[in-house]
């Protein structure tokens, strides 16, 4: 039978520059002598020879003279390989072949790792910062392996995922330098932290920067937005109103105006250096350039989608700074419900029927109410399901199970809670036997 060769199941993790032991063992029979042993270590994939022991002798390293066996332990069945000064290029699978009279082999994985340095943080621009300025924060960490995972968060633990660009470059030794860039609009002050994780070592390196922008002594710009959410129908254009009071002699060259998504800090639209910098939001936004000088910083959002719903912040910086957030509530009216009956013919009083009320392409989720011909609510045996399509619009299907009386009217009301729009359909079932829909 075959010789049993044992290696660790889990990869051997080795730090770059250190020595690693790839364990391999076999069970020698009584009377075993090293003269009988053939031991070969090779790279599993390329079959390149790494080290061997044959004819009673260590044949030495065939792998950059960085490998060694444990000669004093071979006779006890220890065929482990020592790999010195581990490099990134060593990562992979090594196979240990043992042959005495019988033969056996097993492969062991080497996972190379190198810890990342404590990140350094740089800020651009890094002086004369004011609230409302857009800054680029770069987090750099060096000489790690394998590629890092990078996470950003603010000073209260809120993850920052919008406007992050991370690049990782390998040097000649295969070690990675990671550079992660976060673009943010400064508030009154803020802490931004970057965490660089080595996924193999589960080693975290983190740094943070706290930015306290200068405030001018004259106080903040008062920025005004509507308190109530702006309600916009899907597919239409919406105006997110924002205004400020320009001082006498104000010129647009002094104005920094930034619209961004409140939570993710994603840039939406900006006006800086005396000109409209355009839309950073799917080219669906516009300012009112002729009105800016009068303090109208409103934003036009075209062809509103469900995904646009949320809070938008209007930052205005002249010499001073101010900001305010306005909520966009997206809505879409529900279609007039269609009613179907199952079964829909040869109906008799006492039959149980299923009435389905379907209404389409509304937002947000609908409220559905059933009632009979006398206005009595029907709440038992109602099942309502709402499914969003790719655009986020809901199709609502509400199913009522009833036992027919001599005749009856059943009506379904589908309400859009934001628009307070009601769409209703009803079905009247009369006579016996009856069919649905009634024949002309």
């Amino acid at each position: 039978g075959a010789l049993e060769v044992q290696v660790p199941e889990d990869p051997v993790v080795a730090l770059v520059g250190t020595d690693a032991t790839l364990c391999c063992s076999f069970s020698p029979e009584p009377g075993f002598s090293l003269a009988q042993l053939n031991l070969i270590w090779q790279l599993t994939d390329t079959k390149q020879l790494v080290h061997s022991f044959a004819e009673g002798q260590d044949q030495g390293s065939a792998y950059a003279n960085r490998t060694a066996l444990f000669p004093d332990l071979l006779a006890q069945g220890n065929a482990s390989l020592r790999l010195q000064r581990v490099r990134v290029a060593d990562e992979g699978s090594f196979t240990c072949f043992v042959s005495i009279r019988d033969f056996g082999s097993a492969a062991v994985s080497l996972q190379v790792a190198a810890p990342y340095s404590k990140p350094s943080m740089t800020l651009e621009p890094n002086k004369d910062l004011r609230p409302g300025d857009t800054v680029t924060i770069t987090c750099s960490s060096y000489q790690g392996y394998p590629e890092a995972e990078v996470f950003w968060q603010d000073g209260q633990g809120v993850p920052l995922t919008g406007n992050v660009t991370t690049s990782q470059m390998a040097n000649e030794q295969g070690l990675f330098d990671v550079h992660s860039i976060l673009r943010v609009v400064l508030g009154a002050n803020g802490t931004y932290s970057c965490l660089v994780r080595n996924p193999v070592l589960q080693q975290d390196a983190h740094s943070s920067v706290t930015i306290t922008p200068q405030r001018s002594p004259t106080g903040a710009v008062e920025v005004q937005v509507p308190e109530d959410p702006v309600v916009a129908l899907v597919g239409t254009d919406a105006t997110l109103r924002c205004s400020f009071s320009p001082e006498p002699g104000f010129s647009l060259a002094q104005l920094n105006l930034i619209w961004q998504l409140t939570d993710t800090k994603q840039l939406v639209h900006s006006f800086t250096e005396g000109r409209d910098q355009g839309s950073a939001y799917a080219n669906r936004t516009a300012l009112f350039p002729d009105l800016l000088a009068q303090g109208n910083a409103s934003l036009r959002l075209q062809r509103v989608r469900v995904a646009d719903e949320g809070s938008f912040t209007c930052f205005v910086s002249i010499r001073d700074f101010g900001s305010a957030a306005v909520s966009l509530q997206v809505a879409a009216p529900y279609s007039k419900p269609s009613m179907t009956l199952e079964p829909n013919k040869d109906l008799r009083p006492g039959d149980t029927v299923t009435i389905t009320c379907s209404s389409y392409r509304g937002y947000p989720e609908a409220e559905v109410f059933w009632q009979d011909g006398q206005g009595v609510p029907l709440t038992g045996n109602v099942t309502t399901s709402q499914m969003a399509n790719e655009q986020g619009l809901f199709d609502v299907h509400s199913v009522l199970r009833v036992v027919l009386g001599a005749n009856g009217t059943y009506s379904c009301l589908v309400r859009n809670p934001v628009l307070q729009q009601d769409a209703h359909g009803s079905v009247t079932i009369t006579g016996q036997p009856m069919t649905f829909p009634p024949e002309a």
């Epitope: 996470f151 209260q156 633990g157 809120v158 993710t264």
Partner: antibody, heavy 121, light 106 residues
């Protein structure tokens, strides 16, 4: 002692709204975000959203967008959660919780005692 | 969204047993937190920042990580450990919890 004390149980009709309060004490209210988490009977924990009491920034789970409104009153150190268009599936215990810690590691270190909201016709 | 899947959902064990609860994330998370909840009570912080025990949590609790799999181990179950445990992440929006693992007395 750091504490979050929530308002009492509520029974509501379908289609109506409920507003739950969460009063903070023993720490600087504006220094930490307040989150709302609900738990339906026999079910797990479900995150609804958070508010930063200082900036009043909010973020909501997609499921609750358009139905939930989180507000905070700095003068009374109180956070509020209002849920509209109630349906029977909204019957649950609603918790407020403080997200605390130090950069870059944060967790819910203090929870309110929970407010039971029952939606029934 | 990052999904957190806990396994098992239910676990019956005896006092003195060694038990493990796994929380698998659908993608990498910056850190994982764990909470303990007993019936009729609010959740309590149990383990934060992947492997740090919250105040008052006994040292028989530990967490190990392999890739996106976080494993909570109780080395020797005590009567007060029977509860439901939830994992939680907020590396990216939305914040998510695992569905919970209920640890019951066998």
């Amino acid at each position: 002692e750091v504490q979050l004390v929530q308002s009492g149980a509520e029974v509501k009709k379908p289609g109506s709204s409920v507003k739950v309060s969460c009063k903070a004490s023993g720490y600087s209210f504006t220094s930490y975000t307040i989150h709302w988490v609900r738990q339906a009977p026999g079910q797990g924990l479900e995150w609804m959203g958070y508010i930063n009491p200082n900036s009043r920034n909010t973020d909501y789970a997609q499921k609750f967008q358009g139905r939930v409104t989180l507000t905070a009153d700095k003068s009374t150190s109180t956070a509020y959660m209002e849920l509209s268009s109630l349906r029977s599936e909204d019957t649950a215990v609603y918790y407020c919780a403080r997200y605390s810690g130090s950069t870059p590691y944060w967790y819910f270190d203090v929870w309110g005692q929970g407010t039971t909201v029952t939606v029934s016709s | 969204d990052i999904q957190l899947t806990q396994s098992p959902s239910f676990l019956s064990a005896s006092v003195g047993d060694r038990v493990t609860i796994t929380c698998r994330a659908s993608s990498s998370v910056s850190y994982m937190n764990w909470y303990q909840q007993k019936p009729g009570k609010s959740p309590k912080p149990w383990i934060y920042a992947t492997s740090n025990l919250a105040s008052g949590v006994p040292s028989r609790f530990s967490v190990s990580v392999s890739g996106t799999e976080h494993t909570l181990t109780i080395s020797s179950l005590q009567p007060e450990d029977f509860a439901t445990y939830y994992c939680q992440q907020w590396s990216s929006n939305p914040l998510t919890f695992g569905q919970g693992t209920k640890l019951e007395i066998k």
